[in-house]
Amino acid sequence: VPRWRQQWSGPGTTKRFPETVLARCVKYTEIHPEMRHVDCQSVWDAFKGAFISKHPCNITEEDYQPLMKLGTQTVPCNKILLWSRIKDLAHQFTQVQRDMFTLEDTLLGYLADDLTWCGEFNTSKINYQSCPDWRKDCSNNPVSVFWKTVSRRFAEAACDVVHVMLNGSRSKIFDKNSTFGSVEVHNLQPEKVQTLEAWVIHGGREDSRDLCQDPTIKELESIISKRNIQFSCKNIYRPDKFLQCVKNPEDSSCTSEI
C-alpha cells in the first residue's frame, strides 16, 4: 500500500541530488588545492544527516553544524563579494577576478547552488515530489536554513571593505527581506568591517540616473551606519563594459566611467 506523503507547495528535491552533491564536492576539491584534504563522502554524510528523517519544517542551524565543520574554509576576508538578485553577474565577475569570492565560490555554496532538497519525518527517504516553500509552507525548511547558516558565516568572516552587487533594475534595489538584507547585513562585524560598498548595476543602456540616491539604498545606508560601518555606493552604468575592464583594466576605455 503506497504510504501517504505530505504535499508541499515547492518543487521537490533536485533529481540525482546525492550524486550531484558528491560530484560537485569531488570537482571542487580537485580544483582548489587548499580543500584537497576534504573527504567528500563524509561531506555528503553530514549534508544528508542535516535533513534526512527530520520534519522538513523543523530544521535548525544546529542540524547543519557537522557539515559546516567539514566545510570550514578560509577565504581572504577582504575579497568578499555579496550580491542580491543579481547572481549571474556576480559570478561572471568572480570568474574573471579570481581572487574575489561570492558565497557560491566556497565549497559549501558551490555544493548547494541552485539545488533543492528535503526529507520526511521518520523515514530515510529523500522527497523528490515536493519540498516546503518558504512563504507558503514554512521558513525553517532544509534549503532556507542552509542558506541562512552559510550566509551568516560568510558575512561574519568579512573584513575591511565588503562589496555587494545590487540589481538596479528591481523596484527594491535593496530588499530587507532578501538573504543579503535579512542575514548578511546584520552579521557583518563592525570591529572588522570598515566599509560596505554597494555596486548598483544598471539595466538600461541609456540609464544615467544616480541609483545610489534610491530610497532603498538610503535605507541600507541607514542600517549600515547604525552598525558603525561606513557605507559607500557606486553606480555601474555599463555592466558589459565593467566586465571587459575587469578582464583588461589596461584598456584605454577603462579610464572613463563604467
Partner: nanobody
Framework: EVQLVESGGGLVQAGESLRLSCAAG???????MGWFRQAPGKEREFVAA????????WYGDSVKGRFTISRDNAKNTVYLQMNNLKPEDTAVYYC??????????????????WGQGTQVTVAS
C-alpha cells in the same frame, strides 16, 4: 601608464600633523589608491587605501583613527592627512595605484604603479 608624484613630507615634532599629496598623470576614474611606508631596514607597510568609489577606505592598525585617506577626482590627487604623529611614523611614504580599483587589498604586490616616495620624519 600612471605617473604618481608625492609631496608634503618633511620634519615635524611628535603630536603635530602633516598632509601628503599624490598627483596622478591621468584621470582617477576606476583607480584604487593606496599609501604605504617603509622605515629603514623594515618591510614596506600598508598605511591606507581606498576603492574606485573614492569613499570606501581602510587603514593599517597602527594608523587607524589618526590618518585619513581622501581624494579629489577633479584634481586627480589623493591625500593622506596624518594627525598626532609619533616617532614610529618616521618612514618614506609611497603612493600607489591599482588599475583594478574595485579590489580591496593591503598587499604591495597588488598595486600596479608607485610614486618615488616622500620622507616623513617625526622628532620626539
Amino acid at each position: 601608464e600612471v605617473q604618481l608624484v608625492e609631496s608634503g613630507g618633511g620634519l615635524v615634532q611628535a603630536g603635530e600633523s602633516l598632509r601628503l599629496s599624490c598627483a596622478a598623470g591621468r584621470t582617477f576614474t576606476n583607480l584604487g589608491m593606496g599609501w604605504f611606508r617603509q622605515a629603514p631596514g623594515k618591510e614596506r607597510e600598508f598605511v591606507a587605501a581606498d576603492t574606485w568609489s573614492g569613499t570606501s577606505t581602510w587603514y593599517g592598525d597602527s594608523v587607524k583613527g589618526r590618518f585619513t585617506i581622501s581624494r579629489d577626482n577633479a584634481k586627480n590627487t589623493v591625500y593622506l592627512q596624518m594627525n598626532n604623529l609619533k616617532p614610529e611614523d618616521t618612514a618614506v611614504y609611497y603612493c600607489a595605484a591599482r588599475l583594478r580599483g574595485w579590489i580591496t587589498t593591503r598587499k604591495p604586490n597588488e598595486y600596479d604603479y608607485w610614486g618615488q616616495g616622500t620622507q616623513v620624519t617625526v622628532a620626539s
